[in-house]
Amino acid sequence: MASAGMQILGVVLTLLGWVNGLVSCALPMWKVTAFIGNSIVVAQVVWEGLWMSCVVQSTGQMQCKVYDSLLALPQDLQAARALCVIALLVALFGLLVYLAGAKCTTCVEEKDSKARLVLTSGIVFVISGVLTLIPVCWTAHAIIRDFYNPLVAEAQKRELGASLYLGWAASGLLLLGGGLLCCTCPSGGSQGPSHYMARYSTSAPAISRGPSEYPTKNYV
Protein backbone atom coordinates (compact mmCIF):
# COMPACT_ATOMS: atom_id res chain seq x y z
CA MET A 1 0.00 0.00 0.00
CA ALA A 2 2.86 2.33 0.88
CA SER A 3 4.42 2.00 -2.57
CA ALA A 4 1.16 2.80 -4.38
CA GLY A 5 0.64 5.73 -2.06
CA MET A 6 4.11 7.02 -2.84
CA GLN A 7 3.45 6.66 -6.55
CA ILE A 8 0.17 8.58 -6.35
CA LEU A 9 1.83 11.22 -4.20
CA GLY A 10 4.66 11.46 -6.72
CA VAL A 11 2.27 12.04 -9.61
CA VAL A 12 0.21 14.56 -7.63
CA LEU A 13 3.37 16.48 -6.69
CA THR A 14 4.61 16.53 -10.28
CA LEU A 15 1.20 17.74 -11.49
CA LEU A 16 1.27 20.52 -8.89
CA GLY A 17 4.83 21.29 -9.97
CA TRP A 18 3.79 21.49 -13.60
CA VAL A 19 0.92 23.89 -12.81
CA ASN A 20 3.27 26.00 -10.68
CA GLY A 21 5.82 26.01 -13.49
CA LEU A 22 3.19 27.08 -16.00
CA VAL A 23 2.01 29.95 -13.78
CA SER A 24 5.61 30.95 -13.03
CA CYS A 25 6.50 31.11 -16.72
CA ALA A 26 3.35 32.98 -17.67
CA LEU A 27 3.24 35.60 -14.91
CA PRO A 28 5.16 38.83 -15.58
CA MET A 29 6.59 38.84 -12.07
CA TRP A 30 10.13 37.57 -12.46
CA LYS A 31 11.71 40.93 -11.63
CA VAL A 32 10.01 43.60 -9.55
CA THR A 33 11.07 47.24 -9.37
CA ALA A 34 9.58 49.68 -6.89
CA PHE A 35 10.16 53.27 -8.04
CA ILE A 36 9.79 55.52 -5.04
CA GLY A 37 13.00 57.50 -5.56
CA ASN A 38 13.43 61.25 -5.60
CA SER A 39 13.30 61.34 -9.41
CA ILE A 40 9.89 59.66 -9.63
CA VAL A 41 6.84 61.78 -8.86
CA VAL A 42 4.22 59.02 -8.74
CA ALA A 43 5.14 55.78 -6.97
CA GLN A 44 4.92 52.85 -9.36
CA VAL A 45 5.82 49.19 -9.46
CA VAL A 46 7.27 47.61 -12.58
CA TRP A 47 6.86 43.88 -13.11
CA GLU A 48 9.05 42.16 -15.67
CA GLY A 49 8.36 38.69 -16.98
CA LEU A 50 9.49 36.42 -19.78
CA TRP A 51 6.78 37.52 -22.17
CA MET A 52 5.72 40.99 -21.04
CA SER A 53 6.33 43.81 -18.60
CA CYS A 54 3.67 45.59 -16.54
CA VAL A 55 3.57 48.95 -14.79
CA VAL A 56 1.31 49.27 -11.76
CA GLN A 57 0.62 52.85 -10.71
CA SER A 58 -0.05 53.84 -7.10
CA THR A 59 -3.68 54.34 -8.18
CA GLY A 60 -3.91 50.61 -8.90
CA GLN A 61 -4.04 51.06 -12.66
CA MET A 62 -1.99 48.44 -14.51
CA GLN A 63 -0.60 48.61 -18.03
CA CYS A 64 1.09 45.63 -19.65
CA LYS A 65 3.19 45.52 -22.78
CA VAL A 66 4.16 42.33 -24.59
CA TYR A 67 7.79 42.30 -25.75
CA ASP A 68 7.85 43.18 -29.42
CA SER A 69 10.71 41.48 -31.21
CA LEU A 70 12.14 38.10 -30.26
CA LEU A 71 15.54 38.94 -31.75
CA ALA A 72 15.75 42.24 -29.89
CA LEU A 73 15.38 40.50 -26.54
CA PRO A 74 18.45 39.85 -24.35
CA GLN A 75 19.95 36.39 -24.83
CA ASP A 76 19.41 35.42 -21.19
CA LEU A 77 15.70 36.21 -21.51
CA GLN A 78 15.46 34.16 -24.70
CA ALA A 79 17.23 31.28 -22.96
CA ALA A 80 14.91 31.54 -19.94
CA ARG A 81 11.88 31.46 -22.23
CA ALA A 82 13.19 28.41 -24.08
CA LEU A 83 14.09 26.52 -20.89
CA CYS A 84 10.71 27.29 -19.35
CA VAL A 85 8.80 25.99 -22.36
CA ILE A 86 11.08 22.94 -22.69
CA ALA A 87 10.69 22.16 -18.96
CA LEU A 88 6.89 22.24 -19.27
CA LEU A 89 6.91 20.05 -22.38
CA VAL A 90 9.35 17.60 -20.78
CA ALA A 91 7.07 17.34 -17.72
CA LEU A 92 4.08 16.70 -20.01
CA PHE A 93 6.08 13.98 -21.74
CA GLY A 94 6.87 12.52 -18.32
CA LEU A 95 3.17 12.42 -17.51
CA LEU A 96 2.41 10.66 -20.80
CA VAL A 97 5.15 8.10 -20.07
CA TYR A 98 3.66 7.53 -16.63
CA LEU A 99 0.14 7.12 -18.04
CA ALA A 100 1.45 4.78 -20.73
CA GLY A 101 3.09 2.75 -18.00
CA ALA A 102 -0.16 2.51 -16.09
CA LYS A 103 -2.03 1.39 -19.21
CA CYS A 104 0.63 -1.08 -20.34
CA THR A 105 -0.13 -3.38 -17.46
CA THR A 106 -3.49 -4.25 -19.02
CA CYS A 107 -1.95 -5.36 -22.28
CA VAL A 108 1.51 -6.48 -21.23
CA GLU A 109 1.91 -9.48 -18.99
CA GLU A 110 5.52 -8.60 -18.12
CA LYS A 111 5.44 -6.83 -14.78
CA ASP A 112 8.82 -5.15 -15.22
CA SER A 113 7.71 -3.07 -18.20
CA LYS A 114 5.40 -0.93 -16.09
CA ALA A 115 8.11 -0.42 -13.49
CA ARG A 116 10.53 0.69 -16.16
CA LEU A 117 8.03 3.21 -17.51
CA VAL A 118 7.31 4.59 -14.04
CA LEU A 119 11.05 4.87 -13.40
CA THR A 120 11.49 6.61 -16.78
CA SER A 121 8.69 9.05 -16.00
CA GLY A 122 10.32 9.78 -12.65
CA ILE A 123 13.64 10.54 -14.35
CA VAL A 124 11.87 12.72 -16.92
CA PHE A 125 10.16 14.68 -14.12
CA VAL A 126 13.51 15.16 -12.37
CA ILE A 127 14.99 16.49 -15.65
CA SER A 128 12.01 18.84 -15.97
CA GLY A 129 12.61 20.05 -12.41
CA VAL A 130 16.26 20.80 -13.19
CA LEU A 131 15.28 22.60 -16.41
CA THR A 132 12.79 24.71 -14.42
CA LEU A 133 15.44 25.50 -11.82
CA ILE A 134 18.03 26.84 -14.31
CA PRO A 135 16.25 30.01 -15.56
CA VAL A 136 14.86 30.75 -12.09
CA CYS A 137 18.27 30.53 -10.41
CA TRP A 138 19.96 32.36 -13.25
CA THR A 139 17.50 35.27 -12.97
CA ALA A 140 17.73 35.33 -9.18
CA HIS A 141 21.54 35.36 -9.43
CA ALA A 142 21.44 38.33 -11.84
CA ILE A 143 19.05 40.26 -9.54
CA ILE A 144 21.20 39.61 -6.46
CA ARG A 145 24.41 40.45 -8.34
CA ASP A 146 22.89 43.77 -9.46
CA PHE A 147 21.69 44.50 -5.95
CA TYR A 148 25.22 44.26 -4.58
CA ASN A 149 26.90 45.95 -7.56
CA PRO A 150 27.71 49.53 -6.48
CA LEU A 151 27.86 50.76 -10.07
CA VAL A 152 24.36 49.62 -10.95
CA ALA A 153 21.97 52.54 -10.43
CA GLU A 154 19.20 52.21 -7.86
CA ALA A 155 16.61 52.66 -10.61
CA GLN A 156 18.06 49.66 -12.45
CA LYS A 157 18.03 47.37 -9.43
CA ARG A 158 15.34 44.73 -9.21
CA GLU A 159 13.81 42.55 -6.53
CA LEU A 160 12.92 38.87 -6.68
CA GLY A 161 9.43 38.52 -8.07
CA ALA A 162 6.67 36.08 -7.13
CA SER A 163 7.31 34.08 -10.32
CA LEU A 164 10.76 33.12 -9.07
CA TYR A 165 9.33 31.73 -5.83
CA LEU A 166 6.69 29.85 -7.83
CA GLY A 167 9.48 28.58 -10.07
CA TRP A 168 11.46 27.30 -7.10
CA ALA A 169 8.32 25.64 -5.76
CA ALA A 170 7.62 24.11 -9.18
CA SER A 171 11.16 22.80 -9.45
CA GLY A 172 11.04 21.37 -5.93
CA LEU A 173 7.72 19.64 -6.56
CA LEU A 174 8.92 18.18 -9.87
CA LEU A 175 12.17 16.96 -8.32
CA LEU A 176 10.39 15.54 -5.28
CA GLY A 177 7.59 13.96 -7.30
CA GLY A 178 10.03 12.55 -9.83
CA GLY A 179 12.23 11.27 -7.04
CA LEU A 180 9.28 9.52 -5.39
CA LEU A 181 8.36 7.86 -8.69
CA CYS A 182 11.95 6.67 -9.06
CA CYS A 183 11.92 5.34 -5.50
CA THR A 184 8.72 3.32 -5.98
CA CYS A 185 10.48 1.15 -8.54
CA PRO A 186 12.60 -1.81 -7.45
CA SER A 187 16.31 -1.90 -8.18
CA GLY A 188 16.04 -5.36 -9.75
CA GLY A 189 13.41 -7.53 -11.42
CA SER A 190 13.57 -10.26 -8.72
CA GLN A 191 11.02 -8.61 -6.46
CA GLY A 192 7.41 -9.55 -6.72
CA PRO A 193 4.45 -7.62 -8.09
CA SER A 194 3.87 -5.98 -4.71
CA HIS A 195 6.05 -3.14 -5.98
CA TYR A 196 3.78 -2.27 -8.87
CA MET A 197 0.43 -0.61 -9.03
CA ALA A 198 -1.38 -2.69 -11.65
CA ARG A 199 -4.90 -2.91 -13.05
CA TYR A 200 -5.69 -6.61 -13.22
CA SER A 201 -8.35 -8.21 -15.38
CA THR A 202 -11.00 -10.38 -13.71
CA SER A 203 -9.71 -13.54 -15.39
CA ALA A 204 -7.91 -15.88 -13.00
CA PRO A 205 -4.14 -15.76 -12.92
CA ALA A 206 -2.17 -18.72 -14.38
CA ILE A 207 -1.14 -19.85 -10.92
CA SER A 208 -3.97 -19.33 -8.47
CA ARG A 209 -3.27 -18.19 -4.96
CA GLY A 210 -5.41 -17.76 -1.95
CA PRO A 211 -7.03 -14.35 -1.48
CA SER A 212 -4.80 -13.57 1.46
CA GLU A 213 -1.75 -13.80 -0.81
CA TYR A 214 -2.84 -10.88 -3.02
CA PRO A 215 -1.54 -7.49 -1.88
CA THR A 216 -4.55 -5.17 -1.64
CA LYS A 217 -2.57 -2.30 -3.10
CA ASN A 218 -2.58 -3.99 -6.51
CA TYR A 219 -6.26 -3.18 -6.87
CA VAL A 220 -7.28 0.27 -8.17
Epitope: G37, N38, S39, P74, D76, A142, N149, P150, L151, V152, A153, E154, A155, Q156
Partner: antibody, heavy 119, light 107 residues
Protein backbone atom coordinates in the same frame (compact mmCIF):
# COMPACT_ATOMS: atom_id res chain seq x y z
CA UNK B 1 24.17 71.68 -9.74
CA UNK B 2 26.40 68.73 -8.79
CA UNK B 3 29.80 69.98 -7.70
CA UNK B 4 32.76 67.80 -6.71
CA UNK B 5 36.00 69.52 -5.73
CA UNK B 6 39.09 67.39 -5.11
CA UNK B 7 42.07 68.54 -3.07
CA UNK B 8 45.17 67.15 -1.35
CA UNK B 9 47.17 66.15 -4.41
CA UNK B 10 50.84 66.90 -4.77
CA UNK B 11 54.36 65.52 -5.03
CA UNK B 12 55.26 62.63 -2.74
CA UNK B 13 58.20 60.24 -2.51
CA UNK B 14 57.78 56.49 -3.14
CA UNK B 15 56.63 54.79 0.06
CA UNK B 16 55.03 58.01 1.26
CA UNK B 17 51.44 58.82 2.15
CA UNK B 18 48.85 61.31 1.00
CA UNK B 19 45.23 62.02 1.84
CA UNK B 20 42.86 63.27 -0.84
CA UNK B 21 39.58 65.00 -0.09
CA UNK B 22 36.50 65.62 -2.18
CA UNK B 23 34.04 68.32 -1.11
CA UNK B 24 30.56 67.63 -2.50
CA UNK B 25 27.77 70.13 -2.93
CA UNK B 26 24.55 70.61 -4.89
CA UNK B 27 23.04 67.24 -3.95
CA UNK B 28 22.16 65.04 -0.97
CA UNK B 29 25.55 63.47 -0.38
CA UNK B 30 24.49 60.61 1.91
CA UNK B 31 22.28 58.85 -0.66
CA UNK B 32 24.89 58.29 -3.35
CA UNK B 33 27.65 55.79 -3.98
CA UNK B 34 31.01 57.55 -4.37
CA UNK B 35 34.17 56.45 -6.15
CA UNK B 36 37.71 57.43 -7.05
CA UNK B 37 39.06 56.84 -10.56
CA UNK B 38 42.53 57.83 -11.70
CA UNK B 39 43.97 58.74 -15.08
CA UNK B 40 47.60 57.93 -15.72
CA UNK B 41 49.95 60.19 -17.70
CA UNK B 42 49.41 57.76 -20.61
CA UNK B 43 45.70 58.73 -20.46
CA UNK B 44 44.58 55.30 -19.24
CA UNK B 45 41.65 55.27 -16.81
CA UNK B 46 41.82 53.01 -13.75
CA UNK B 47 39.14 52.39 -11.18
CA UNK B 48 40.58 52.92 -7.69
CA UNK B 49 37.82 52.43 -5.12
CA UNK B 50 34.07 52.69 -4.45
CA UNK B 51 32.14 53.27 -1.23
CA UNK B 52 28.42 52.71 -0.58
CA UNK B 53 26.12 55.60 0.36
CA UNK B 54 26.23 54.79 4.06
CA UNK B 55 29.92 53.97 4.03
CA UNK B 56 29.38 50.41 5.22
CA UNK B 57 30.63 48.72 2.07
CA UNK B 58 33.89 49.44 0.26
CA UNK B 59 35.22 47.92 -2.96
CA UNK B 60 38.87 47.88 -4.06
CA UNK B 61 40.87 46.38 -6.92
CA UNK B 62 43.83 44.21 -5.86
CA UNK B 63 46.29 46.86 -7.08
CA UNK B 64 45.40 49.23 -4.21
CA UNK B 65 43.94 46.87 -1.61
CA UNK B 66 45.74 47.26 1.70
CA UNK B 67 47.39 50.51 0.63
CA UNK B 68 44.44 52.81 -0.05
CA UNK B 69 41.46 53.45 2.24
CA UNK B 70 38.28 55.22 1.25
CA UNK B 71 36.02 56.88 3.81
CA UNK B 72 33.26 59.43 3.89
CA UNK B 73 31.88 61.97 6.31
CA UNK B 74 28.22 62.35 5.42
CA UNK B 75 27.78 65.14 7.95
CA UNK B 76 30.48 67.18 6.20
CA UNK B 77 29.60 66.07 2.66
CA UNK B 78 33.19 64.98 2.16
CA UNK B 79 34.82 61.93 0.59
CA UNK B 80 38.38 60.90 1.51
CA UNK B 81 41.08 58.71 0.02
CA UNK B 82 43.97 57.81 2.31
CA UNK B 83 46.90 56.59 0.23
CA UNK B 84 49.97 54.95 1.75
CA UNK B 85 52.98 52.95 0.49
CA UNK B 86 52.76 54.99 -2.70
CA UNK B 87 54.52 53.76 -5.83
CA UNK B 88 55.57 55.50 -9.02
CA UNK B 89 52.71 53.74 -10.86
CA UNK B 90 50.24 55.58 -8.58
CA UNK B 91 51.15 58.82 -10.36
CA UNK B 92 47.91 60.02 -11.89
CA UNK B 93 45.10 62.54 -11.91
CA UNK B 94 42.61 61.37 -9.25
CA UNK B 95 38.94 62.02 -9.90
CA UNK B 96 36.15 62.01 -7.33
CA UNK B 97 32.97 60.52 -8.77
CA UNK B 98 29.34 60.36 -7.75
CA UNK B 99 26.93 57.64 -8.82
CA UNK B 100 23.37 58.34 -9.92
CA UNK B 101 19.86 57.13 -9.12
CA UNK B 102 19.05 56.53 -12.81
CA UNK B 103 22.35 55.84 -14.53
CA UNK B 104 24.81 53.01 -14.07
CA UNK B 105 28.53 53.65 -13.98
CA UNK B 106 30.47 56.76 -13.02
CA UNK B 107 27.90 59.50 -13.57
CA UNK B 108 29.43 62.74 -12.29
CA UNK B 109 33.16 63.52 -12.23
CA UNK B 110 35.08 66.19 -10.38
CA UNK B 111 37.89 68.18 -12.01
CA UNK B 112 40.57 65.98 -10.46
CA UNK B 113 43.67 66.43 -8.33
CA UNK B 114 47.15 65.46 -9.50
CA UNK B 115 49.27 63.04 -7.47
CA UNK B 116 52.91 62.64 -8.46
CA UNK B 117 55.00 59.90 -6.87
CA UNK B 118 58.65 60.54 -7.61
CA UNK B 119 62.05 60.77 -5.97
CA UNK C 1 40.32 40.22 -14.45
CA UNK C 2 38.15 41.12 -17.43
CA UNK C 3 40.15 42.89 -20.11
CA UNK C 4 38.54 45.51 -22.34
CA UNK C 5 40.13 45.75 -25.79
CA UNK C 6 39.20 49.00 -27.48
CA UNK C 7 39.81 49.84 -31.12
CA UNK C 8 40.89 51.84 -32.97
CA UNK C 9 43.40 53.72 -30.78
CA UNK C 10 42.85 56.82 -32.89
CA UNK C 11 40.42 57.81 -35.56
CA UNK C 12 40.12 60.71 -37.97
CA UNK C 13 36.89 61.50 -39.77
CA UNK C 14 35.15 64.37 -41.53
CA UNK C 15 32.19 66.35 -40.21
CA UNK C 16 28.94 64.59 -41.17
CA UNK C 17 30.52 61.15 -41.37
CA UNK C 18 29.52 58.15 -39.27
CA UNK C 19 32.15 56.65 -36.99
CA UNK C 20 32.15 53.48 -34.92
CA UNK C 21 34.34 52.66 -31.94
CA UNK C 22 34.42 49.06 -30.74
CA UNK C 23 35.19 47.45 -27.45
CA UNK C 24 35.61 43.74 -26.83
CA UNK C 25 35.41 42.09 -23.42
CA UNK C 26 37.68 39.13 -22.68
CA UNK C 27 34.68 37.29 -21.22
CA UNK C 28 30.93 37.66 -20.87
CA UNK C 29 29.85 40.94 -19.23
CA UNK C 30 26.18 40.81 -20.29
CA UNK C 31 25.19 44.45 -20.94
CA UNK C 32 27.22 45.92 -18.08
CA UNK C 33 29.11 48.40 -20.21
CA UNK C 34 29.40 52.18 -20.17
CA UNK C 35 30.90 54.67 -22.62
CA UNK C 36 32.60 57.93 -21.60
CA UNK C 37 33.66 61.02 -23.52
CA UNK C 38 36.62 63.12 -22.42
CA UNK C 39 37.24 66.40 -24.15
CA UNK C 40 40.68 68.04 -24.06
CA UNK C 41 41.48 69.39 -20.58
CA UNK C 42 38.16 68.21 -19.15
CA UNK C 43 36.96 65.35 -16.96
CA UNK C 44 35.31 62.30 -18.56
CA UNK C 45 31.53 62.36 -18.98
CA UNK C 46 29.13 59.43 -18.99
CA UNK C 47 27.47 59.01 -22.41
CA UNK C 48 25.98 55.52 -22.48
CA UNK C 49 25.24 52.91 -19.79
CA UNK C 50 23.89 49.36 -19.89
CA UNK C 51 25.54 49.16 -23.35
CA UNK C 52 22.68 50.91 -25.19
CA UNK C 53 21.02 53.47 -22.91
CA UNK C 54 21.79 57.13 -23.49
CA UNK C 55 22.23 59.56 -20.60
CA UNK C 56 19.80 62.50 -20.66
CA UNK C 57 21.20 65.41 -22.65
CA UNK C 58 23.44 63.27 -24.83
CA UNK C 59 22.67 63.94 -28.52
CA UNK C 60 20.72 61.20 -30.28
CA UNK C 61 23.48 60.86 -32.90
CA UNK C 62 25.27 58.75 -30.29
CA UNK C 63 24.16 55.14 -29.96
CA UNK C 64 25.46 52.04 -28.26
CA UNK C 65 25.04 48.43 -29.33
CA UNK C 66 26.04 44.96 -28.22
CA UNK C 67 26.75 41.69 -29.97
CA UNK C 68 27.88 39.05 -27.50
CA UNK C 69 31.08 40.35 -25.94
CA UNK C 70 31.59 43.02 -28.59
CA UNK C 71 30.24 46.50 -27.96
CA UNK C 72 30.09 49.51 -30.26
CA UNK C 73 29.64 53.23 -29.89
CA UNK C 74 28.34 54.78 -33.10
CA UNK C 75 28.36 58.49 -33.83
CA UNK C 76 26.13 59.47 -36.74
CA UNK C 77 26.68 62.76 -38.54
CA UNK C 78 29.91 63.64 -36.74
CA UNK C 79 30.13 67.18 -35.34
CA UNK C 80 33.22 69.23 -34.53
CA UNK C 81 32.30 69.19 -30.82
CA UNK C 82 32.61 65.38 -30.82
CA UNK C 83 36.40 65.67 -30.92
CA UNK C 84 37.42 63.84 -27.76
CA UNK C 85 38.81 60.68 -26.26
CA UNK C 86 36.25 57.88 -25.82
CA UNK C 87 36.48 55.10 -23.26
CA UNK C 88 34.47 51.96 -22.65
CA UNK C 89 34.20 50.47 -19.16
CA UNK C 90 32.64 47.29 -17.83
CA UNK C 91 30.96 47.07 -14.45
CA UNK C 92 30.02 43.39 -14.52
CA UNK C 93 32.30 42.43 -11.64
CA UNK C 94 35.18 43.75 -9.58
CA UNK C 95 37.65 44.99 -10.69
CA UNK C 96 35.92 47.38 -13.06
CA UNK C 97 38.19 48.02 -16.02
CA UNK C 98 38.33 50.57 -18.83
CA UNK C 99 39.33 50.25 -22.45
CA UNK C 100 42.55 52.00 -23.48
CA UNK C 101 40.60 54.78 -25.18
CA UNK C 102 40.02 56.03 -28.72
CA UNK C 103 41.16 59.49 -29.76
CA UNK C 104 38.69 60.95 -32.25
CA UNK C 105 39.83 63.80 -34.47
CA UNK C 106 38.25 65.80 -37.28
CA UNK C 107 39.94 65.72 -40.71
Amino acid sequence: EVKLVESGGGLVKPGGSLKLSCAASGFTFNVYTMSWVRQTPAKRLEWVVTISSGGGRTYYPDSVKGRFTISRDNARNTLYLQMSSLRSEDTAMYYCIRGDYRYDGFAYWGQGTLVTVST
Amino acid sequence: DIQMTQSPASLSASVGETVTITCRASENIDSYLAWYQQKQGKSPQLLVYASTLLVDGVPSRFSGSRSGTQFSLKINSLQSEDVARYYCQHYYSIPYTFGSGTKLEIK
